[in-house]
């Protein structure tokens, strides 16, 4: 019962996590214009992994895709790669874990096969979650570095007559979605690995039985020899399953065209 619950919960948590990783990867708000200590501009800039956007105070938003591969920073390419690997591994993990679920019967699949599949999907979820967390963290590190560089430029470049608005970027919503989603996928993977241990058939019970005389009573009576054996029948616990209903909340609510700066 506990094993099934752990497996089912691990699957649901991983599913939510992977949905979050996909959402984060697709989101445009990986970095957003820093408004603190800045003149109030009537234009708000934000950037994603695939395109950069500008929202004017008029409400109009214009997004431009990065239509080049060679011209993009290596770090951005690395973040893209990590997120995509995370999604692919997660998707495969979900597919494998569906067949590994104890509450789903497929032909005459043995528990050992289900245990192996559960472990495989668990490892995939863990790697997927780590990829997402790594990707988001690399991007965040890139932002922090650029933020302080542009802050330094802001205060060193004040000598000229003409002032320019230095656009600094800070953490966007996608980073937080990515971190949380990666964490959930990781937790789901760990739960699947834990569930795997409970699913594995206890073969050791048969292989490592020690035959010794302790617990056997041997009595010599005039009526002849009587020996009572102390081996009981090896019975397995019958498992019960519960298929609980789970709801998945929306991971990201996008700003309306009337969010103004």
């Amino acid at each position: 019962m506990a094993v099934t619950a752990c497996q089912g919960l691990g699957f649901v948590v991983s599913l939510i996590g992977i949905a979050g990783i996909i959402a984060a990867t697709c989101m445009d708000q990986w970095s957003t214009q820093d408004l603190y200590n800045n003149p109030v501009t009537a234009v708000f800039n934000y950037q994603g992994l695939w395109r950069s956007c500008v929202r004017e105070s008029s409400g109009f938003t214009e997004c431009r895709g990065y239509f080049t591969l060679l011209g993009l920073p290596a770090m951005l390419q690395a973040v893209r790669a990590l997120m995509i690997v995370g999604i692919v591994l997660g998707a495969i993990g979900l597919l494998v874990s569906i067949f590994a679920l104890k509450c789903i019967r497929i032909g005459s699949m043995e528990d050992s096969a289900k245990a192996n599949m559960t472990l495989t999907s668990g490892i995939m979820f863990i790697v997927s979650g780590l990829c997402a967390i790594a990707g988001v963290s690399v991007f965040a590190n890139m932002l922090v570095t650029n933020f302080w560089m542009s802050t330094a430029n802001m205060y060193t470049g004040m000598g000229g007559m003409v002032q320019t608005v230095q656009t600094r970027y800070t953490f966007g919503a996608a980073l937080f979605v990515g971190w949380v989603a990666g964490g959930l996928t990781l937790i789901g993977g760990v739960m699947m690995c834990i569930a795997c241990r409970g699913l594995a058939p206890e073969e050791t019970n048969y292989k490592a039985v020690s035959y010794h005389a302790s617990g056997h009573s041997v009595a010599y009576k005039p009526g002849g020899f009587k020996a009572s054996t102390g081996f009981g029948s090896n019975t397995k616990n019958k498992k019960t399953y519960d298929g609980g209903a789970h709801t998945e909340d929306e991971l990201q609510s996008y700003p309306s065209k009337h969010d103004y700066v």
Partner: antibody, heavy 118, light 113 residues
């Protein structure tokens, strides 16, 4: 056809208040911000502020903050500007304008003339 | 606040003459996010509200004759009328629409010789 119809001329006494309207037609009122601009006789243009009809959120030029109040009414597709504690310096034509792509004011009302005189 | 400086304050021209109006801002109006300059040009005739001519410093509003051309970037902008017509006699204003408060230049008055 997009139109911004402003209320008629006003003659007010110093210290009084005036409330002018700007009725929008020919487009979805809540999709565009309405800006207000002041023009003194024979002089240039001065930005007062804007009202976002979708959120009813205003933004003001610091110079006019506290004296100008911008509101809107979705049901009648009308934006309002109330000006208080009027002085002779406030005698001007007040325009409402719709903000479009590029933060450009593409359609303007015909203007409301306000004369402050005792 | 951003200061918009227009020059000259008035200009006397003849019909079919080429005219260049200048506008300078105290801060750059170039947005790094989309590489667009948030400057607009308006034309105002006596007794009328201003009319939008150019936005994004160089994009002509629909219905505006192609003799009107906007150019420039950062802090220096120009409005060029390639061949002035009698109906072009008006006051021309440039406006900062990048940083609040939005500010207008004092205007350039175009007069007929």
């Amino acid at each position: 056809e997009v139109q911004l119809q402003q209320s008629g001329p006003e003659l007010v006494k110093p210290g009084a208040s005036v409330k002018m309207s700007c009725k929008a037609s020919g487009y979805t009122f809540t999709n565009y911000i309405i800006h207000w601009v002041k023009q003194k006789p024979g002089q240039g243009l001065e930005w007062i502020g804007y009202i976002n009809p979708y959120t009813d959120g205003p933004k003001y030029n610091e110079k006019f903050k506290g004296r100008a109040t911008l509101t809107s009414d979705k049901s009648s597709s009308t934006a309002y500007m109330e000006f208080s504690s009027l002085t002779s310096e406030d005698s001007a034509v007040y325009y409402c304008a719709r903000l479009n792509r590029g933060n450009a004011m593409d359609y303007w009302g015909q203007g409301t003339s306000v004369t402050v005189s005792s | 606040d951003i200061v918009m400086t227009q020059s000259p304050s008035s200009l006397t021209v003849t019909v079919r003459e080429k005219v260049t109006l200048s506008c300078k801002s105290s801060q750059s109006l170039l947005n790094s996010g989309n590489q667009k300059n948030y400057l607009t040009w308006y034309q105002q005739k006596p007794g009328q509200p201003p009319k939008l001519l150019i936005y994004w410093a160089s994009t002509r509003e629909s219905g505006v004759p192609d003799r009107f051309t906007g150019s420039g970037s950062g802090t220096d902008f120009t409005l060029t009328i390639s061949s002035v017509q009698a109906e072009d006699l008006a006051v021309y204003y440039c406006q900062n629409v990048y940083i609040y408060p939005f500010t207008f230049g004092a205007g350039t008055k175009l007069e007929l010789k």
